[in-house]
């Protein structure tokens, strides 16, 4: 029950996170005009990954797309790439995780397959979240650098009494949306990975029964367990408890976590 809840919650959190990453990527307010020097500007500028906008005194907002690909800064291209990779990985992760959900029955899908799919989607969510956080952080770093550079050049070109103020940009709402969304996707991915641990099929634990055959005393245990106590020579290079995903072969070779109480 706890595993299903963890997996379901992980899925929902990741879903919200990826929706947020998509929203942030599409938003125009990645950078907004810093109003410190001109708090009463009638012309307000803000920029996104795909276009820049100007809101005028009339209340009208005009947005123009970046119609060039080669003329854009490499950093902006990198941020775009990171956000798109994050969205794509997240979307694939969501698709995989839908089929991995314990509450959804699809044919005769093995629990081990669901566990693998849960782990795969979890890893995808983690990478997706990291991509979004990295993309937003790169953009934020670019803004901070440009902000201080433009501050240093603030009053260059001052001709006598005439004041020419350079437009500076600060963090826009999309950056905060991106950071939060990336974090949520990351958390959702971790939850999926945690859920995977409990999803691996567990054997029905029968107590070992001794059958006395003529001249031999051999202990048998259903399910092909060898050296049920875990002290046999075949276990010397293996962990008794594995926290990660198990392959179908490994599931047969390891003691169940309920063997030791």
């Amino acid at each position: 029950m706890a595993v299903t809840a963890c997996q379901g919650l992980g899925f929902v959190v990741s879903l919200i996170g990826i929706a947020g990453i998509i929203a942030a990527t599409c938003m125009d307010q990645w950078s907004t005009q810093d109003l410190y020097n001109n708090p009463v500007t009638a012309v307000f500028n803000y920029q996104g990954l795909w276009r820049s906008c100007v809101r005028e005194s009339s209340g009208f907002t005009e947005c123009r797309g970046y119609f060039t690909l080669l003329g854009l800064p490499a950093m902006l291209q990198a941020v775009r790439a990171l956000m798109i990779v994050g969205i794509v990985l997240g979307a694939i992760g969501l698709l995989v995780s839908i089929f991995a959900l314990k509450c959804i029955r699809i044919g005769s899908m093995e629990d081990s397959a669901k566990a693998n799919m849960t782990l795969t989607s979890g890893i995808m969510f983690i990478v997706s979240g990291l991509c979004a956080i990295a993309g937003v952080s790169v953009f934020a770093n670019m803004l901070v650098t440009n902000f201080w550079m433009s501050t240093a050049n603030m009053y260059t070109g001052m001709g006598g009494m005439v004041q020419t103020v350079q437009t500076r940009y600060t963090f826009g709402a999309a950056l905060f949306v991106g950071w939060v969304a990336g974090g949520l996707t990351l958390i959702g991915g971790v939850m999926m990975c945690i859920a995977c641990r409990g999803l691996a099929p567990e054997e029905t634990n029968y107590k070992a029964v001794s059958y006395h055959a003529s001249g031999h005393s051999v202990a048998y245990k259903p399910g092909g367990f060898k050296a049920s106590t875990g002290f046999g020579s075949n276990t010397k290079n293996k962990k008794i408890y594995d926290g990660g995903a198990r392959t179908e072969d490994e599931v047969q070779s390891y003691p169940s976590k309920h063997d030791y109480v």
Epitope: T41, V43, N45, V162
Partner: antibody, heavy 115, light 113 residues
Framework: QVQLVQSGAEVKKPGASVKVSCKAS????????MHWVRQAPGQRLEWMGY????????SYNQKFQGRVTITVDTSASTAYMELSSLRSEDTAVYYC????????WGQGTTVTVSS | DIQMTQSPSSLSASVGDRVTITCRSS????????????LTWYQQKPGKAPKLLIY???TRESGVPSRFSGSGSGTDFTLTISSLQPEDFATYYC?????????FGGGTKLEIK
């Protein structure tokens, strides 16, 4: 076509208040801010403030701060400008202005402040 | 506040003349966000509301005759009427549309010589 129709001329006593209305038609009222500009006889045009009909957000010229209040009734596509504590120097023609580039002006409302 | 200074305050000209009105702002009206200068020119006739002629310093409003042209950038702007027509005799105002409070020039009264 886009049109702004203002209320009629007003004569007020010093210390009184005046409320001028401006009815908009021919465009979506909430698409543009509504500005108010006045012109005293023989003087330059003077911006008083504006209102964003979407959220009721306002910005006023510091010169009129505390005396001017701009409001809107979006259901009636009408903007209002109220100026209180009237003085003789407030005698002017008051205009409402809207659309992009502030292209459309009302016909003007003459407010006379006289004792 | 941005101060707008217009010159001359009045001028006399004849029909067919080329007229230039200048406007200077105390701060730059150039917006780097869209590379536009937020200066507007209006024409006002006695007893009438101002009429928009030019926005963004040089873009003519639709319906405005081509004899009206605007130029300039930053803090210095000009309005030129290439060949004066009888209906052009009026008062012309420049306006800062870049920063609140929006401010207007003192006006240039164009009279018949």
């Amino acid at each position: 076509q886009v049109q702004l129709v203002q209320s009629g001329a007003e004569v007020k006593k010093p210390g009184a208040s005046v409320k001028v209305s401006c009815k908009a038609s021919g465009y979506t009222f909430t698409d543009y801010n509504m500005h108010w500009v006045r012109q005293a006889p023989g003087q330059r045009l003077e911006w008083m403030g504006y209102i964003n009909p979407n959220n009721g957000g306002t910005s006023y010229n510091q010169k009129f701060q505390g005396r001017v209040t701009i409001t809107v009734d979006t259901s009636a596509s009408t903007a209002y400008m109220e100026l209180s504590s009237l003085r003789s120097e407030d005698t002017a023609v008051y205009y409402c202005v809207t659309t992009r580039y502030l292209a459309v002006w009302g016909q003007g409302t003459t407010v006379t402040v006289s004792s | 506040d941005i101060q707008m200074t217009q010159s001359p305050s009045s001028l006399s000209a004849s029909v067919g003349d080329r007229v230039t009105i200048t406007c200077r702002s105390s701060q730059s009206l150039f917006n780097s966000g869209n590379q536009k200068n937020y200066l507007t020119w209006y024409q006002q006739k006695p007893g009438k509301a101002p009429k928009l002629l030019i926005y963004w310093a040089s873009t003519r409003e639709s319906g405005v005759p081509s004899r009206f042209s605007g130029s300039g950038s930053g803090t210095d702007f000009t309005l030129t009427i290439s060949s004066l027509q009888p209906e052009d005799f009026a008062t012309y105002y420049c306006q800062n549309d870049y920063s609140y409070p929006l401010t207007f020039g003192g006006g240039t009264k164009l009279e018949i010589k």
